[in-house]
Interface confidence: low
């Protein structure tokens, strides 16, 4: 039975973080989801990814601090370094929900976590680095415009001791460490994947009970490359991951490969383009996409096809499968356990056969040997005597793998702000590096399209100012 006035909420600030949000969404869907799924996005999320997000999330809500109510705009102007934090605080405005659980886009849900909704505001798990503070990657909150205003006021007056949302929320909910123990979530609800646990007996004892894993630190799962044939995550340079982190990374990539990549091929040409009523690329703030005569928002087509992903010969809108490829096949797992009324096609990749796919669902000639669902990989983490084992009807059947051709279409690539390179032996996700002129940079800022996590990070701006002032 679904509970319509409660929701899991996440935030995706750009196309890269959307990959994490999609994995998180699909991992939640996999475990008897009974609540709504909501994703907050910022204006720079591309139109194509908005469409894909809408296949996984019940609500995709754009948050634009520049266009916001006066008091939000004022807070942003006063504390521009807290742009990302103020965006995250927007979750308190979701007042059509009585209670929500916020999960960062770099988390992965390993089992049903409905019991979190039994907790009150403000519930969170201790931070591994300083357990008297909570980690703000997973928390239970009650939407309220009053609380939202108080949080913004607090942000303006006090800033954040760590320059991010965690510092701000800890100073706002400052009694968390000393009051109600019920508001201390067990560590298994926000297990840091990359901490080399000093108390390793505890990890051995309790790590297998983990319900939510959090990929803290600068190396996110999408920063690694993945070999779908061996099912292994490829190490990046000097970065080496511990055995348990490798297992969690493998889980993340398994979900990505089986339940996120197929969504790209199910997006039809018209879907990324035609959205009556409001612009995909926010023409109302002079964005890069001109409105077409039909009043339909066009996706941004302002970059050349990425070198990493060669272009296909067939145009995006083609109704014919690419030559030499089999007809699109439908894969719908009838045994999939879904929330009341939800059709499995919403989550699993291939479009219905009467609507020809833009990207043909071409099974690779050599299916990958690795387990395609969680159950086998979870044995790395779960002891045999674990009570809550995942029942077979909850498991995604292996979905057909995404062929390398799938993402070669130039207009599909142009619509994304990321380079997705997919081959038989490697999948990688990289940020598109687009050199903008100073004028374009300034216009992006004026439009509120600020990359808080990347090149517009406060530290980088400070660096530039320091150089300028020297």
């Amino acid at each position: 039975m679904s509970v319509t006035d409660q929701a899991f909420v996440t935030l995706a600030t750009n196309d890269i973080y959307c990959q994490g949000a999609l994995v998180l969404g699909q991992s939640l869907r996999r475990h008897r989801l009974t609540r709504k799924l909501v994703v907050l996005i910022t204006p720079q999320v591309s139109s194509l990814l908005r469409v894909i997000l809408s296949k996984v999330f019940d609500e995709v809500i754009e948050v634009n601090l520049i266009d916001s109510a006066d008091y939000i705009h004022l807070a942003f102007l006063k504390r521009p370094e807290l742009g990302l934090t103020l965006t995250k605080l927007h979750c308190w405005t979701l007042t059509h929900y009585s209670k929500c659980v916020f999960l960062d886009a770099d988390t992965l849900v390993l089992s049903n976590v409905d019991e979190l909704f039994d907790r009150g505001e403000f519930s969170a798990a201790p931070d591994p680095g300083w357990p008297d503070c909570f980690n703000s990657g997973v928390f239970v909150f009650q939407p309220s415009l009053h609380t939202h205003k108080l949080l913004l006021q607090h942000a303006m007056e006090h800033g954040s001791f760590d320059g991010a949302d965690q510092g701000l929320l800890n100073s706002f909910f400052r009694n968390w460490s000393t009051t109600d123990i019920h508001k201390h979530l067990p560590f298994i609800y926000n297990l840091s994947s990359n901490t080399m646990y000093t108390y390793s007996p505890a990890f051995k004892q309790f790590g297998s009970s983990a319900k939510v894993v959090h990929f803290l630190g600068s190396m996110k799962p999408w920063n690694y490359k993945y070999n779908p044939q061996s099912g292994s995550v490829l190490e990046q340079g000097s970065v080496s991951s511990s055995q348990h982190q490798a297992a969690f990374l493998h889980l993340w990539w398994t979900v990505y490969q089986n339940n996120v990549l197929p969504l790209y091929k199910s997006v039809q040409a018209g879907e990324a383009r035609a959205s009556p009523g409001h612009t995909l690329c926010r023409s109302d703030v002079g964005g890069p996409c001109a409105d077409s005569a039909s009043g339909v928002g066009e996706p941004c087509e302002n970059s050349t096809p990425s070198a990493g992903v060669p272009c296909a010969n067939s145009p995006l809108g083609s109704n014919q499968p690419a030559q030499g490829l089999p007809e699109p096949t439908q894969i719908v797992d009838e045994t999939l356990s879904l929330p009341e009324g939800r059709r499995s096609e919403d989550m699993i990749a291939c479009p219905e056969t009467e609507t020809p796919a833009v990207i043909t669902c071409d099974p690779l000639s050599q299916p990958s040997p690795q387990p395609a669902d969680f159950t086998e990989t979870e044995t790395i983490l779960q002891p045999a005597n674990k009570v809550e084992s995942v029942s077979s009807e909850e498991t995604f059947e292996p979905s057909q793998e995404l062929p390398a051709e799938a993402l070669r279409d130039p207009s599909l690539q142009d619509a994304l702000e990321v380079d997705l390179a997919v081959s038989v032996s490697q999948i990688s996700i990289e940020e598109k590096v687009k050199e903008l002129s100073p004028e374009e940079e300034r216009r992006k800022w004026e439009e509120g399209r600020i990359d808080y996590m990347g090149k517009d990070a406060f530290a980088r701006i400070q660096e530039k100012l320091d150089r300028f002032l020297q």
């Epitope: 908005r50 995709v60 059509h96 018209g270 929330p339 059709r343 919403d346």
Partner: antibody, heavy 119, light 109 residues
């Protein structure tokens, strides 16, 4: 061309039933949250029922709860409203409308179909 | 239940003039969830503004929305002949999911 076309309206006696249909074309129906909204001179615009893009979530106005049933068939690009135990105050023009991505507003509307409940 | 009250009920203006329409909520509404629609006689409503201030596709820039909390405004900077219609504000909440204002009629003076 983006279009929603309602059908199934008509004259019905109090206590009777009607089934309204809404056919969508020109856009990806399965990505839209859909609603039925009605309009009468007495009550103005009044939201009746909502169904999420996948059909998972359904909601009704208190005035119709238990009497009306909303449903959708994404394969057929169609939205339906089954109206039972109709009352004179259900008399109105019924519109189907949809919202893309978010359900908070309605960016596409049909032309409406008239339902008259009278003895 | 959030009640939206629009004022004035009727606004009589000439083409080229500025129109300011008000929508007041009985309790605070998130600006993310406030929309404005235009309806001409015999036609369905048409979305103008969503999220209190974002213009929908194809809507001329003479239409703008503003406000937060309980007070929202739709402004038409220079009225054109096709702008004479009825305007409704709408909020999205929990129960009922949507509520509409009673409308403001903008008529030619």
């Amino acid at each position: 061309v983006v279009q929603l076309g309602e059908s199934g309206g008509g004259l019905v006696k109090p206590g009777g039933s009607l089934r309204l249909s809404c056919a969508a074309s020109g856009f990806t129906f399965s990505s839209y949250h859909m609603n039925w909204v009605r309009q009468s001179p007495e009550k103005g615009l009044e939201w009746v029922s909502y169904i999420s893009s996948s059909g998972t979530y359904i909601d009704y106005a208190d005035s119709v709860r238990g009497r009306f049933t909303i449903s959708r068939d994404n394969a057929k690009n169609s939205l339906y409203l089954q109206m039972n135990i109709l009352r004179p105050d259900d008399t109105a023009v019924y519109y189907c409308s949809g919202g893309y991505y978010s359900s908070s507003h309605m960016d596409v509307w049909g032309k409406g179909t008239t339902v008259t409940v009278s003895s | 239940e959030v009640v939206l009250t629009q004022s004035p009920g009727t606004l009589s203006l000439s083409p080229g003039e500025r129109a300011t329409l008000s929508c007041r909520a009985s309790q605070s509404v998130s600006s993310n969830y406030l929309a404005w629609y235009q309806q001409k006689l015999g036609q369905a409503p048409r979305l103008l503004i969503y999220g209190a201030s974002s213009r929908a596709t194809g809507i001329p820039d003479r239409f703008s929305g503003s406000g937060s909390g309980t007070d929202f405004t739709l402004t038409i900077s220079r009225l054109e002949a096709e702008d004479f219609a009825v305007y409704y504000c709408q909020q999205y909440g929990s129960s009922p999911r949507y509520t509409f204002g009673q409308g403001t009629k903008v008529e030619i003076r």
